[in-house]
């Protein structure tokens, strides 16, 4: 029950996170005009990954896309790439995790396959979250650098008579959305990996190990991780009676890779 809850919660958290990453990527407010020197401006500038916008005090907003690919800063291209990779990995992760959910039965899918899929989606969510956090952090660093550079030469002009104010940009709402969304996706991924550890032994098809006894041979099927942690109902952890006598060496057990996670 706890495994299902952990897996389900991980899925939901990741879903919210990925939705947030998509929203942040599409948002225009990655950087917004710094209003420190002129809090009341009749023209407000803000920029996104794909276009820059100007909002006039009348309410009219005009946006222009970045219609060049080669002319854009390498850092901006890198941020775009990181966010897209994050979205793609997250989307694939969501697709995989839907089929991995314990509460959803799809044909005669092996439980071990579900554990594998849960782990795969978990890793994908973690990488997706890290990509988003990295992308947003790179952009934020770029903003900080540019902010102090533009502060250094804030005013330029002819003998100080005519001033040209260089527009300074500060953190926009999209950065905070991206950081939170990336964090949620990361947490969701970790939860999926934890759920996978709990799922693993239950899905593993172990061969019974027989111990030679003078009377009836009693073979114990180990309950593994699940039995010791109390995750779920351990119905398969029961005694198997076998009349045949075999030595320990003759018996092969097939442990799953998940036993050692």
């Amino acid at each position: 029950m706890a495994v299902t809850a952990c897996q389900g919660l991980g899925f939901v958290v990741s879903l919210i996170g990925i939705a947030g990453i998509i929203a942040a990527t599409c948002m225009d407010q990655w950087s917004t005009q710094d209003l420190y020197n002129n809090p009341v401006t009749a023209v407000f500038n803000y920029q996104g990954l794909w276009r820059s916008c100007v909002r006039e005090s009348s309410g009219f907003t005009e946006c222009r896309g970045y219609f060049t690919l080669l002319g854009l800063p390498a850092m901006l291209q890198a941020v775009r790439a990181l966010m897209i990779v994050g979205i793609v990995l997250g989307a694939i992760g969501l697709l995989v995790s839907i089929f991995a959910l314990k509460c959803i039965r799809i044909g005669s899918m092996e439980d071990s396959a579900k554990a594998n899929m849960t782990l795969t989606s978990g890793i994908m969510f973690i990488v997706s979250g890290l990509c988003a956090i990295a992308g947003v952090s790179v952009f934020a660093n770029m903003l900080v650098t540019n902010f102090w550079m533009s502060t250094a030469n804030m005013y330029t002009g002819m003998g100080g008579m005519v001033q040209t104010v260089q527009t300074r940009y500060t953190f926009g709402a999209a950065l905070f959305v991206g950081w939170v969304a990336g964090g949620l996706t990361l947490i969701g991924g970790v939860m999926m990996c934890i759920a996978c550890r709990g799922l693993a032994p239950e899905e593993t098809n172990y061969k019974a190990v027989s111990y030679h006894a003078s009377g009836h041979s009693v073979a114990y099927k180990p309950g593994g991780f699940k039995a010791s942690t109390g995750f779920g109902s351990n119905t398969k952890n029961k005694k198997i009676y076998d009349g045949g006598a075999r030595t320990e060496d003759e018996v092969q057990s097939y442990p799953s890779k998940h036993d050692y996670v």
């Epitope: 009749a42 023209v43 500038n45 009219f60 005519v162």
Partner: antibody, heavy 120, light 113 residues
Framework: QVQLQQSGAELAKPGASVKMSCRAS????????MHWIKQRPGQALEWIGY????????EYNQKFKGKATLTADKSSSTAYMQLSSLTSEDSAVYYC?????????????WGQGTSVTVSS | DIVMTQSPSSLSVSAGEKVTMSCKSS????????????LAWYQQKPGQPPKLLIY???TRESGVPDRFTGSGSGTDFTLTISSVQAEDLAVYYC?????????FGAGTKLELK
């Protein structure tokens, strides 16, 4: 067509207050900011401030803070400006002007003006 | 505050003449975000409110005759009347539309010679 109808001329004593109105018609009142401008006889125009009729948010020129108070009544599509503690310096023509949409923050329609005379 | 300086303060012209008046701002009115200039020109006739002629430094307001042309960028702007008509005799104001408080120039008075 768009019209901004301002109230009639005001004669007031020093220290008194006056409240003038600007009634909008021919457009959606709440969709445009309403600005107020002062013009003393033979002098240039001075921006007083604006009101957003939707939110009642106001922004004032520092020079007119405490002197002018801008309000708006959505139900009657009317903007108001109250001038307090009047002095002879406040004798002027006051205009209301609508900030045009897609007009680069320019005022595309103006009222006919309200003349205020401060005299003892 | 942005200071708007207009020159000359008055102009005496004959009908049909070409007229040019200047407006300089103490700070650039060119917005880096959209590369647009936030400057307007108004015409005010005696006893009347100002009338918008040009916005965005060069865009003519609807209904304004094409003899009125706005030009310039950054801090230097010009209003040109290609062929002055009797009805053009008025005071012309330039206005900063970029920064609050919005500020106006002292005006250029166009008179008949």
């Amino acid at each position: 067509q768009v019209q901004l109808q301002q109230s009639g001329a005001e004669l007031a004593k020093p220290g008194a207050s006056v409240k003038m109105s600007c009634r909008a018609s021919g457009y959606t009142f709440t969709s445009y900011l309403m600005h107020w401008i002062k013009q003393r006889p033979g002098q240039a125009l001075e921006w007083i401030g604006y009101i957003n009729p939707t939110t009642d948010y106001t922004e004032y020129n520092q020079k007119f803070k405490g002197k002018a108070t801008l309000t708006a009544d959505k139900s009657s599509s009317t903007a108001y400006m109250q001038l307090s503690s009047l002095t002879s310096e406040d004798s002027a023509v006051y205009y209301c002007g609508r900030l045009g949409y897609y007009k680069r923050n320019a005022m595309d329609h103006w009222g006919q003006g309200t003349s205020v005379t401060v005299s003892s | 505050d942005i200071v708007m300086t207009q020159s000359p303060s008055s102009l005496s012209v004959s009908a049909g003449e070409k007229v040019t008046m200047s407006c300089k701002s103490s700070q650039s009115l060119l917005n880096s975000g959209n590369q647009k200039n936030y400057l307007a020109w108004y015409q005010q006739k005696p006893g009347q409110p100002p009338k918008l002629l040009i916005y965005g430094a060069s865009t003519r307001e609807s209904g304004v005759p094409d003899r009125f042309t706005g030009s310039g960028s950054g801090t230097d702007f010009t209003l040109t009347i290609s062929s002055v008509q009797a009805e053009d005799l008025a005071v012309y104001y330039c206005q900063n539309d970029h920064f609050y408080p919005l500020t106006f120039g002292a005006g250029t008075k166009l008179e008949l010679k």
